[in-house]
Structures are given as C-alpha cells and as structure tokens.
Interface confidence: low
C-alpha cells in the first residue's frame, strides 16, 4: 500500500494554483481554486497540509482543473496546494506540489498601523511620508484626513504596506488609513488608529480612531456598474464608515488620482 504523509515528490514540474474571485473573501462567498499544469494531466488533487489523500480531486484530461468551494466558512481558510498526475506515471506518483495558496475567509482584515516617516513632526518645507502597514500583500490602501469627507489618497500595493507622501506645507493634520481587497467581493480592514502630524514645536499625539472627533464619513466611491461596495455600518457603528474605492472600470484597477484629492 502507498501511504505517503505528503504527496510523493517527483521531478514533474509543479502546477500553478490560483483563486477566484480572490484569496481573501468574506464568509459565504463561492471560491474556485484553479490548478493549472504545465502539461495535460489526468488527475488533479487539492491538498491541505498534513492530509495524505487529496481534499478534492478532479479527473480532467487537460491542463486545468477547477475545485469549487461553495459558501466558504473561516474553517475552509488556510493553506492549499495542488498536484497533478498522468496515468503513465504509475500508482501514487504526483507532480511537485504547487506553491502554497493561502485562502483567508474573514469578515474583517486586521487593523493596519499608520506611522510617519521620518517622524510625525514636520519641519519647514519638509515633506512627510505616511506608511499604512497591514499584513497582506496586493491590497488597496486608503488614507483619510480629519475634516475631509473623501479619501485623501489611495494606493494599490504589492507589498503589505503603502506609502503616502504629504507636502510639508499641507501636512499637519489628523490621519487614519485602512486597506481592502482590490476587487469584489470586498473585504475591509479595521481602521488604523489616528496619527497626528504637527509642525515642529507642536506635540504630536495618537488617539484611538473610534474617539477621533471631527472625522467625517467619506463620500461614495466612484461608481462601478459591475460591483457594489459593501455597507460597513453594521460593524462600524462609531467613527468612519469606510468603503473601498472601486476601480473606474470593471476590468482594471486605475491607479490614477482619486476623484477627490484635496489638501495634498
């Protein structure tokens, strides 16, 4: 009997594993994991760590197999890999496993931090960078300023952080940020604690976002007929009601300046 503790390693090149609509989703979303082999295969297996047998398998005489995870729950999150095999390889022989795909099923992403680089005190004529740092790569980051309804800036970042540059003359103020998945179905983070940028000689202070006075809710995001921004009022009763900035078109994320970009 063949009882490997992991899919047997072999010299067959690894497949690629991806997720639709995203690797970060809210509970209840239908997720499709796509395993693509570099050559036509007979069987594709979807593995989780520690599993001897595949979680799911598909017999597909082609390069692509799809695994459907219906109405996912947080328990279905975690690390996945896929392997493929050909019938002429003999029993129990699988390809090298794909790179890991981490599926995160959550109502809300972890709170980011917001820090000033080089620091929260701005000298005359000096610019300051605000770094909004989350825990996940390939997210869209949004910066808000107290008293300004619309998002101040947004960035899509391949790194788990994004840097926002503020011109020195207009830098002082109270800021917060959050991040969200770049496409629907949107998952949003909690809002960072606020960060106060001050002139030299004034003392900076930080205070919890939920108690920040004068922060206004942002206006509606740019309209996208193909997606609907989630309402967050149900779990953000205090402070900002944050909504993702939707792409200008269904097909692409447009990193051009947002519709409203005052005070920078």
């Amino acid at each position: 009997d063949i009882t490997p503790s992991v899919p047997p390693a072999s010299y067959h090149p690894k497949p690629w594993l991806g997720a639709q609509p995203a690797t970060v989703v809210t509970p209840g979303v239908n997720v499709t994991l796509r395993c693509r082999a570099p050559q036509p295969a007979w069987r594709f297996g979807l593995f989780k760590p520690g599993e001897i047998a595949p979680l799911l398998f598909r017999d597909v005489s082609s390069e692509l197999a799809e695994f459907f995870l219906e109405e996912v729950t947080p328990a279905q999150g975690g690390i996945y890999r896929c392997c493929y095999r050909r019938p002429d390889w003999g029993p129990g022989v699988w390809s090298q496993p794909s790179d890991v795909l981490e599926l995160l099923v959550t109502e809300e992403l972890p709170r980011p931090s917001l820090v000033a680089l080089p620091g929260p005190v701005v000298g005359p004529g000096a610019n300051v960078s605000l770094r909004c740092a989350g825990r996940l790569r390939n997210m869209s980051f949004v910066l808000y300023r107290e008293g300004v309804a619309a998002p101040l800036q947004y960035r899509h970042s391949a790194q788990p952080w994004a840097d926002f540059t503020l011109l020195g003359a207009r830098a002082p103020g109270t800021y917060s940020c959050y991040y969200h998945t770049p496409s629907a179905p949107y998952v949003l983070s909690q809002r960072s604690e606020v960060l106060v940028i001050s002139w030299e000689g004034e003392g900076p202070e930080a205070r919890p976002a939920s108690s920040a006075p004068g922060m206004q809710a942002p206006g509606p995001p740019p309209s996208d007929p193909g997606a609907q921004a989630p309402s967050l009022s149900s779990f953000r009763p205090r402070g900002l009601v944050l909504q993702p900035l939707l792409p200008q078109t269904q097909d692409s994320w447009d990193p051009a300046p947002p519709p409203s970009d005052p005070g920078v």
């Epitope: 297996g45 001897i52 047998a53 595949p54 979680l55 017999d59 029993p91």
Partner: antibody, heavy 120, light 107 residues
C-alpha cells in the same frame, strides 16, 4: 488486515430510501478513498461514485448523481451510501471498495456486498 | 463517457489451457486500466492494475498487457479456481466504467 464490512440485505418498498453502510478496519480510514459499485443480476459492474472520508469530498457518476448520496463518519470509520426514490431498477448488490492507491484508483479491497431488493 | 468493450462475452475452456481476454477503450486511456475477477456470489478481486501490474497475492499465471486503447488479460495454464467472470475498468476521467464482462466456464 484491511476489512470492509457492509450492512445486511434490505427489502424496501418502491419510492422509499435505503442507507447502506460500510465499516472499515485495519487501516487509517481517512487516508483512502471509498468507492461504491453496483452489480445487477446478469449484468456488469457499474461505478457509482467515490468519497474521500477525510474531507467528505465526493465525485459521482452522473447517472447516479440524483440517486446516491455518499457520506462518511470518521469517528466510526464508516462510509454510507443512501439511495433515494427507489425503483425496481435499483434492485442490485451494492459493494463498497477501498482504493489501493491513496488518491482513489484501483479497487483493491471490497466489502462483501449488500443486496437491496425493491419490491411492493 | 469512455466505453469499454470486452470480448469475448463468454468462453468455455478446459483446465490447463491458456486464455486471453481483450478490452478495448473508446478513446486513449494510456495504461490506466484494471482487471478484476468475480466469482458467483462473491466480491470482485483486483488482479491487475495500471494495465500490467499484478496485484498482491495474484498468481503469476495472470498477466496484463496493452496501452492506449487495446488491452488484454492472459491466463496461462487455467486452474479450476480461475473460473468466473472477468471485468476490465478504466481510470481515465470520471465516470470510471467497466467492460461488460467475460464469463469463463469449464468445458
């Protein structure tokens, strides 16, 4: 040694359902697929479907997709097949089998079979 | 679905003879084929897997050959316990189908 022990013969009425069990022993239940096969008198073998007892993942022969439901109980190392809306065509011996290969191929170990008779 | 055509449907032979049963797939299935023996009132038994590999405990008088679409099971020097029905089964894409069977009877 590997053993698959199936439930006893069933005499059932048309239109009702029946649940056949297959208790596994002698190996790690969640490490191997359990297959189900139908054998009608004087006819050949038909593959019904397969379940991964570890995950509950299933693959069915389309012909049986609305007829058979495969489940597994890890705590008792038992696989089940429920047959619904029974007709005389469902009268057959049903076998469970375990794959030789951990990913579900080559039916190396078989249960003794369960005779299901559908009769008014 | 892939169709498996087995021949002959029945065969009447004597102990000590050699027989060959063939199985043809409706499309290429590489070496992805198994052979089973089933005796009256008993469960099937795996004889050959991956077209040519003998399962544990199967006597060496049994042998499997072929790949692609044409396969055969050969039994040398038939023994009394070899009589019964034989089935091929493919494993290339669900549903995994069996051949119609070959009934091997004593002459």
């Amino acid at each position: 040694q590997v053993q698959l022990q199936q439930s006893g013969a069933e005499l059932v009425r048309p239109g009702t359902s029946v649940k056949v069990s297959c208790k596994a022993s002698g190996y790690a239940f969640t490490n191997y697929m359990i297959e189900w096969v139908k054998k009608r008198p004087g006819q050949g073998l038909e593959w019904i479907g397969v379940i991964n007892p570890g995950s509950g993942g299933t693959n069915y022969n389309e012909k049986f997709e609305n007829k058979a439901t495969l489940t597994a109980d890890k705590s008792s190392s038992t696989a089940y097949m429920q047959l619904s809306s029974l007709t005389s065509d469902d009268s057959a011996v049903y076998f469970c089998a375990r794959s030789l290969d951990f990913d579900g191929a080559w039916f190396a170990y078989w249960g003794q079979g369960t005779l299901v008779t559908v009769s008014a | 679905d892939i169709q498996m055509t087995q021949s002959p449907a029945s065969l009447s032979v004597s102990v000590g003879e050699t027989v060959t049963i063939t199985c043809r797939a409706s499309e290429k299935i590489y070496s992805n084929l198994a052979w089973y023996q089933q005796k009256q009132g008993k469960s099937p038994q795996l004889l050959v897997y991956a077209a040519t590999n003998l399962a544990d405990g199967v006597p060496s008088r049994f042998s499997g050959s072929g790949s692609g679409t044409q396969f055969s099971l050969k039994i040398n020097s038939l023994q009394p316990e070899d009589f019964g029905s034989y089935y091929c089964q493919h494993f290339w894409g669900i549903p995994w189908t069996f051949g119609g069977g070959t009934k091997l009877e004593i002459k």
